[in-house]
């Protein structure tokens, strides 16, 4: 029997150097296109292969981006957030929130062929 799934929320400061194809990730969210119900925050939807974010390795799909170069991303229209990233300069500091899935209680045996292995 599997236990309850909880989430561990952590924050991290990630410094990226803009590459030839930008910062190397796509975002979703904003006050005009909420990605998470009742949350107008900005989330990472895709990490581009061999882009700046992928090569750094810390930013993950599903991470929430709290600020860019100290600029809070709360209550922004989607395009305002896009343009903040686009004009953020060469060295970009991101404050991000990771949401890690953790399992409480007994964990069931992983059978052969389990794709999560």
């Amino acid at each position: 029997m599997n236990g309850r799934v909880d989430y561990l929320v952590t924050e991290e400061e990630i410094n990226l150097t803009r590459g030839p194809s930008g910062l190397g990730f796509n975002i979703v969210g904003g006050t005009d296109q909420q990605y998470v119900s009742n949350d107008s925050g900005i989330y990472v939807s895709r990490i581009k292969e061999n882009g700046a974010a992928a090569l750094d390795g810390r930013l993950q799909e599903g991470d929430k981006i709290l600020s860019v170069n100290g600029q809070d991303l709360k209550n922004l229209l989607h395009q305002d957030a896009v343009d903040l990233f686009r004009n953020a300069g060469y060295a970009v500091s991101l404050r991000v929130q990771h949401r890690l899935q953790v399992q409480n209680g007994p964990i069931g045996h992983r059978g052969e062929g389990d794709p999560s292995g």
Epitope: D32, L76, Q79, D80, D83, N87
Partner: nanobody, 124 residues
């Protein structure tokens, strides 16, 4: 989707007045500009206003006759034009800065990332 929709253009006699409006959606807190393009001529800067509304700049040829203003609650920018001259005849375009809460305003077309379709002003 970002949209800038101009209105208020038309035919007016020399010496008359017009008030152009530009309704903005999809972006906020942008420095805004008005440009114009007469037939066979380059698009030229007319006026700009900062995102907060506390700073404006005008091309010399319209100073004293034109006022740019904004209502951030309505996300609308205005261009009040008085003492109109035949040489003011052009299509007038509203434009929004490509940067969110940018510091400087200015006449450079390169600063403006989003454009409306334009409204025709004809001074006879």
């Amino acid at each position: 989707e970002v949209q800038l929709v101009e209105s208020g253009g038309g035919l007016v006699q020399a010496g008359g007045s017009l008030r152009l409006s530009c309704a903005v959606s999809g972006v906020s807190f942008r420095n805004m500009g008005w440009f114009r393009q007469a037939p066979g001529k380059e698009r030229e800067f007319v006026a700009a206003i900062s995102w907060s509304g506390d700073s404006t700049v005008y091309v010399d040829s319209v100073k004293g006759r034109v006022t740019i203003s904004r209502d951030n609650a309505k996300n609308t920018v205005y261009l009040e034009m008085n003492s109109l001259k035949p040489e003011d005849t052009a299509v007038y375009y509203c434009a929004a800065d490509g940067r969110f809460r940018a510091g400087q305003i200015g006449p450079s077309l390169g600063l403006y990332h989003y454009w409306g379709q334009g409204t025709q002003v004809t001074v006879s």
